[in-house]
């Protein structure tokens, strides 16, 4: 049977290296060899390229080598497949070398900021040695901040045949490290070079970008003063490398600026002790180049009624994220503050917060939270300078079985009944939401019974036991991940009730 007609011919001109064509089918059922017929020098000349029919038969690729590679030029390519039964020819295909030329990548030799020009990096590179001299080259410059995985791209062309070329990349973030890589191609070509080796550069530092400011209001002290824990961080979008030398805080009661107090600190948190009135708090960060814009916060009066607009909230897990969504009765509220911290018996060591705008959901990567830890998540509505009532929920990013089961004891042992009491497992050992408890009990040499109760029940009365019988019992606490048994306890039912026993003594 004749070989299949060669199709899907694709050719590429590796500048000053070779002209290579590939085709399909790549494999034939019977032994097949190929001849590639070419015309070049604009059709004036004609030659062939053969796949070696001893070692490289069935190899659907062939390369023409210098010195017969001329540029610019138009080629025609036709592939002939031959086996013992005969020859099958492809259609004739036409190739303009300028359109299929692939050159070496350029070499970036510097990425530097230019003194006095903000938010710009100047990239200098060497045009590839193996590139046609007269040709206009098009370039793609890829860049990203050093800690990002997302590349941005800019395209441009260069007509000059300078060996040393430059491009000014503008509208960058201040004081940020960028990774750059560059590729090029002749202007008419469909094939790009590979990417150059990556090079890193840093934009010039500026005055700080700005701050996000939040607070935790604590209960008033005996003397009437209110502790307010202020906290701030670089605003979303601020340069990663930005360093503040310090922070200036000033605050005063509403309508009374002559009672302004100021604080200077190098920390990103500060506790204020305020009176019962409404206060205004302002914070700026500064470095050697200047101050950031002012971050402002209104602390409500002690007796102020706060608005409530969040009606419901759900936390759900996707493959790699925790998503919290809420419903609001106030369409005008479009800013929210989310707080999250571990629900532990002691004072939380890590407290986090983040502003959300133009959305009613908040997402966090699962790996930013600890598995097996319960997190308290609160969402505050923010309408201009007013902060509303929070709505709170709890979530685990990953549940496990409890680290310990419930500590159990048997009370009120009777002839046929017993009351079992157990303690809640400490928060640090739950590893998930306790769904239910299961009581397993078994008479000596008897069948095991079990009873499952809701997680809010910590006591249960077992009935229909056998008198004067030894029982073993344990309580299992279960999360979505499974259950853990508590310590095993033993008890023996009475032969007669205490009530009858006492009566008998009286006689």
């Amino acid at each position: 049977v004749l070989p299949a007609k060669p199709e899907n011919i694709s050719c590429i001109f590796y500048y000053e290296e070779n002209f290579t064509c590939t085709w399909s089918p790549e494999k034939e059922a019977s032994y097949t060899w190929y001849k590639v017929k070419r015309t070049y020098s604009y059709g004036y000349k004609s030659d062939i390229c053969s796949t070696d029919n001893s070692t490289r038969g069935n190899h659907a690729s062939c390369s023409f080598l210098p010195p017969t590679i001329t540029n610019p030029d138009n080629y025609t390519i036709q592939v002939e497949a031959q086996n013992a039964d005969g020859i099958m020819k492809s259609d004739i295909t036409y190739w303009n070398l300028d359109a299929i030329m692939k050159i070496e990548p350029p070499e970036i030799f510097s990425v530097k900021s230019v003194l006095g020009i903000k938010r710009m990096l100047q990239i200098k590179w060497i045009r590839p040695v193996l590139a046609p001299h007269s040709s206009t080259l098009k370039y793609t410059l890829r860049f990203r901040t050093i800690n990002s995985a997302y590349w941005m791209e800019v395209n441009f062309t260069k007509e000059d045949i300078d060996r040393d070329e430059t491009y000014n990349l503008t509208e960058l973030q201040a004081f940020t490290e960028y990774v750059m890589t560059l590729r090029c191609a002749p202007a008419e070509s469909m094939f790009w070079s590979g990417w150059s080796q990556e090079k890193v550069g840093t934009t010039e530092e500026e005055a700080p970008y700005g701050l996000d400011l939040w607070r935790v209001l604590k209960p008033a002290m005996v003397d009437g003063r209110r502790p307010v824990q202020l906290m701030w961080k670089k605003a979303t979008g601020a340069p990663v490398l930005e360093k503040a030398l310090g922070y200036n805080i000033w605050y005063f009661p509403e309508n009374n600026t002559n009672l302004t107090e100021t604080v200077n600190t190098t920390n990103q948190t500060h506790e204020l002790y305020l009176g019962g009135k409404t206060y205004w708090v302002y914070v700026v960060s500064y470095n050697s180049l200047g101050e950031s814009p002012v971050a402002t916060l209104r602390i409500p009066a002690l007796n102020e009624k706060t608005f409530q607009c969040i009606e419901a909230m759900q936390a759900c897990l996707t493959q790699d994220q925790l998503v919290v969504e809420w419903q609001s009765s106030a369409p005008e509220v479009d800013t929210w503050m989310v707080e999250w911290f571990p629900d532990v018996d002691s004072e939380p060591s890590s407290f986090s917060w983040e502003s959300v705008s133009q959305a009613r959901n908040w997402t966090i990567q699962k790996d930013e939270l600890k598995p097996l830890w319960c997190y308290n998540i609160s969402v505050y509505p923010v309408l201009r300078d007013r902060v509303g009532q929070p709505y709170s929920t709890q979530a685990y990013v990953q549940e496990g079985i409890p680290s310990a089961g419930p500590v159990t004891q048997a009370d009120s042992i009777g002839v046929k009944t017993v009351t079992i009491t157990w303690k809640e497992i400490p928060k640090s050992k739950r590893n998930g939401f306790i769904k239910n408890y299961t009581i397993f009990y078994q008479a000596e040499d008897g069948k095991e019974f079990s009873k499952t109760v809701n997680s809010n029940i910590l006591q249960y009365r077992l009935e229909s036991l056998t008198r004067r019988t030894s029982y073993s019992l344990q309580v299992m606490a279960s999360t979505n991940a499974g259950g853990t048994n508590g310590t095993k306890i033993n008890f023996k039912t009475l032969s007669i009730s205490h009530h009858h026993h006492h009566h008998h003594h009286h006689h």
């Epitope: 020098s41 059709g43 004036y44 004609s46 030659d47």
Partner: antibody
Framework: EVQLVESGGGLVQPGRSMKLSCAAL????????MAWVRQAPTKGLEWVAS????????YYRDSVKGRFTISRDNAKNTLYLQMDSLRSEDTATYYC???????????WGQGVMVTVSS | QFTLTQPKSVSGSLRSTITIPCERN????????VSWYQQHLGRPPIIVIY?????PSEVSDRFSGSIDSSSNSASLTITNLQMDDEADYFC???????????FGGGTKLTVL
């Protein structure tokens, strides 16, 4: 419509020179290799010379090398053949031809007669 | 360097089929494309086959070209011979040694 029109032929004495011209019409002249092919009376076709698109590369049959010069003026869409030291065996009809894209001469002029005789 | 050899003449009766061979004496016939030209008396040649077996759109489909590697020759076949087919036919190929085209000696076709 592609047209090739030769001119400049005639009678010339051995050892003298003659220049043939070929005006090209109806196609982008600068995109094609061009050739001169001759045919002696009652004989077959014989390639004489060819020239690349920009004129940088020229090709000749051995018997005319050093005596004939092929050239082109892309601005004027014209092909030339300068023939020096002419011999009687150069007597032939000279055709101007276009090299097509696939190793063939796809268009030919009407031909011009060159007679080398004393 | 190679030569292309054609028979001096071939004849065929009206509406019959003839084949004109063109044999390459040195190197493989398939190493470069073969073209065929028709030349009526006193007229310039016109191309009838290029790239071994390709026919220009304006040429009758009675004309076909082929390559036979076993005899190292190309062939021009004309079916259903017409009186107007009476002409000289030349094969041509590219020779990389001389960096130029090589023509066969030509075949005179007579239609009886």
């Amino acid at each position: 419509e592609v047209q090739l029109v030769e001119s400049g032929g005639g009678l010339v004495q051995p050892g003298r020179s003659m220049k043939l011209s070929c005006a090209a019409l109806g196609f982008t002249f600068s995109n094609y290799y061009m050739a001169w092919v001759r045919q002696a009376p009652t004989k077959g076709l014989e390639w004489v010379a060819s020239i690349s698109t920009g004129g940088g590369n020229t090709y000749y049959r051995d018997s005319v090398k050093g005596r004939f010069t092929i050239s082109r003026d892309n601005a004027k869409n014209t092909l030339y053949l300068q023939m020096d030291s002419l011999r009687s065996e150069d007597t032939a009809t000279y055709y101007c031809a276009r090299h097509g894209t696939i190793a063939a001469m796809d268009y030919w002029g009407q031909g011009v007669m060159v007679t080398v005789s004393s | 360097q190679f030569t292309l050899t054609q028979p001096k003449s071939v004849s065929g009766s009206l509406r019959s089929t003839i084949t004109i061979p063109c044999e390459r004496n040195n190197g493989d016939i398939g190493d470069s494309y073969v073209s065929w030209y028709q030349q009526h008396l006193g007229r310039p040649p016109i191309i009838v086959i290029y790239a071994d077996d390709q026919r220009p759109s304006e040429v009758s489909d009675r004309f076909s070209g082929s390559i036979d590697s076993s005899s190292n020759s190309a062939s021009l076949t004309i079916t259903n011979l017409q009186m107007d087919d009476e002409a000289d036919y030349f094969c041509q190929s590219y020779d990389s040694n001389i960096d130029g085209p090589v023509f066969g000696g030509g075949t005179k076709l007579t239609v009886l």
